[in-house]
């Protein structure tokens, strides 16, 4: 559980707070809501920012919900339930004792169901695709530069290793990032691509979660990059699990924003 | 040297409120947490909740989210909490203790609710 | 919420014995335990910090051991002075919890 150490504070997340009785008398930092220690030389889990956010005083900004055909990230509006290791525990119940199963970003991917409901391992999501919309500009960006560009971003920003960008396509003005990481390919260590498009999402969004940076600021050789419709998929390693008449209508996790 | 100094023993009748202060010097009181504990009669140890005097971000226990104040006043370096619609199952010695892992402990405040 | 189990609930020993206590967490909880000595009318007192870190002025008889679920305070040579109550208390996330303690005795 590292911090700086000079005066205590966690560079990777700025829902914490820190103080000097870690082990070792070292800077420990905890996560706002679940209490638990994070490592501040990293990103912290989505889970454990996600209670964060539900812990954080009520006058933060609304969000409108997304369609209730979409399986959606509720982006916060749910206060999850994070194993140990502050990975979300497949199964999350709300004080109803309504239940649902979820993947390793959090998004539902069962019916609802009650307390008899079973999920039976936490289901990985190992590709995600960020699909963005850029503002008008004077004229399309270069593929390779703007490529070049994200892929620095996220190793550079989320310290995700770039192996698991597997590509950047354009055709202006939508922008599509694809993040892959299997369950074998995640070394101990390793950034989760679920935790970094989260970061990315709210770095996109103008709500950073980095302590003390401004926010992001993407430009592409000098040209501002201002993204004004953010669209993200996610697809598990085992595909989800709804009833037939849902499956009709729907054939990605989606997470919309405006 | 580190210290925390509790105020007095209290008397209270059932429904009535009660505050209690703990005082710290020998350190920087910004910079830790101060934890609430109370230990009833012939009982165990039980953690009420927690407060970082900086930014005054507090945490209860479920069981006294309803009823348990915690405040700080960092001019004073004191912590405060105040247990409301007191009952007899109240009565306890309440303590207050510093950092995660309670180093320092005040010497803890005999609260009687009794008609 | 993290349960802490403490076993035995009484201890029965004598002194220049060896005394060993138990902790038992709910859930994996790393090494965040912490061990306490409490006497009649005192405050507890911190004993051993993060499972094993000790702690100045606590005399070196007393260890701590464990991570993950299971957590060992040891006494290597009982003091007169050491019977008293002991306490787990773990630190992992909230809501803190204390284990129910043990009553350490002279036989």
């Known amino acids: 559980h590292t911090a700086a150490q000079d005066n205590c504070t966690c560079p990777t997340n700025k829902m914490t707070v820190c103080s000097p009785d870690g082990p070792g008398g070292r800077c420990q930092c905890r996560a706002l809501g679940s209490g638990m220690a994070v490592d501040c030389s990293t990103l912290t889990s989505k889970c454990l920012l996600l209670k964060a956010r539900m812990s954080a005083p009520k006058n933060a900004r609304t969000l409108v919900r997304p369609s209730e055909h979409a399986l959606v990230d509720n982006d916060g509006l749910y206060d999850p339930d994070c194993d140990p290791e502050g990975r979300f525990k497949a199964r999350q119940c709300n004080q109803t004792s309504v239940c649902w199963c979820v993947n390793s970003v959090g998004v539902r991917r069962t019916d609802k169901g009650d307390l008899s409901l079973r999920c039976d391992e936490l289901v990985r999501t190992h590709h995600i695709l960020i699909d963005l919309r850029h503002r008008p500009t004077a004229g399309a960006f270069n593929h390779s530069d703007l490529d070049a560009e994200l892929r620095r971003l996220f190793r550079e920003r989320y310290r995700l290793h770039p192996k698991f960008v597997a590509a950047v396509h354009y055709e202006q003005p939508t922008i599509q990032i694809e993040l892959r990481q299997n369950t074998s390919q995640k070394a101990a260590g390793d950034v989760d691509i679920g935790d970094a498009a989260y970061y990315f999402e709210r770095d996109i969004k103008g709500e950073s979660l980095f302590q003390g940076r401004g926010g992001l600021d993407l430009r592409v050789r000098g040209e501002p990059l201002q993204v004004e419709r953010t669209l993200i998929y996610y697809l598990d390693e085992i595909p989800p699990k709804f009833s037939m008449k849902r499956l009709t209508h729907h054939h990605h996790h989606h997470h919309h924003h405006h | 040297q580190v210290q925390l100094v509790q105020s007095g023993a209290e008397v209270k009748k059932p429904g009535a409120s009660v505050k209690v202060s703990c005082k710290a010097s020998?350190?920087?009181?910004?910079?830790?947490?101060i934890h609430w504990v109370r230990q009833a009669p012939g009982q165990g140890l039980e953690w009420i909740g927690t407060?970082?005097?900086?930014?005054?971000?507090?945490v209860y226990n479920q069981k006294f989210r309803d009823r348990a104040t915690m405040t700080a006043d960092r001019s004073i370096s004191t912590a405060y909490i105040e247990l409301s619609r007191l009952r007899s199952d109240d009565t306890a010695v309440y303590y207050c203790?510093?950092?995660?892992?309670?180093?320092?402990w005040g010497q803890g405040t005999t609260v009687t609710v009794s008609s | 919420e993290i349960v802490l189990t403490q076993s035995p609930a009484t201890l029965s020993l004598s002194p220049g014995e060896r005394a060993t206590l138990s902790c038992r967490a709910s859930?994996?909880?790393?090494?965040?335990i912490h061990w306490f000595q409490q006497k009649p009318g005192q405050s507890p007192r911190l004993l051993i910090k993060?499972?094993?870190e000790s702690i100045s002025g606590i005399p070196s008889r007393f260890s701590g051991s464990g991570s993950g679920t299971d957590f060992t305070l040891t006494i290597s040579s009982l003091e007169p002075e050491d019977f008293a109550v002991y306490y787990c208390q773990h630190s992992h996330s909230w809501p803190f919890t204390f284990g129910q303690g043990t009553k350490l005795e002279i036989k």
């Open positions: 203790a510093r950092a995660s892992y309670f180093d320092y």
């Open positions: 407060i970082f005097p900086s930014n005054a971000y507090a």
């Open positions: 859930q994996n909880i790393g090494t965040s």
């Open positions: 993060y499972a094993s």
């Open positions: 020998g350190y920087t009181f910004t910079t830790h947490w």
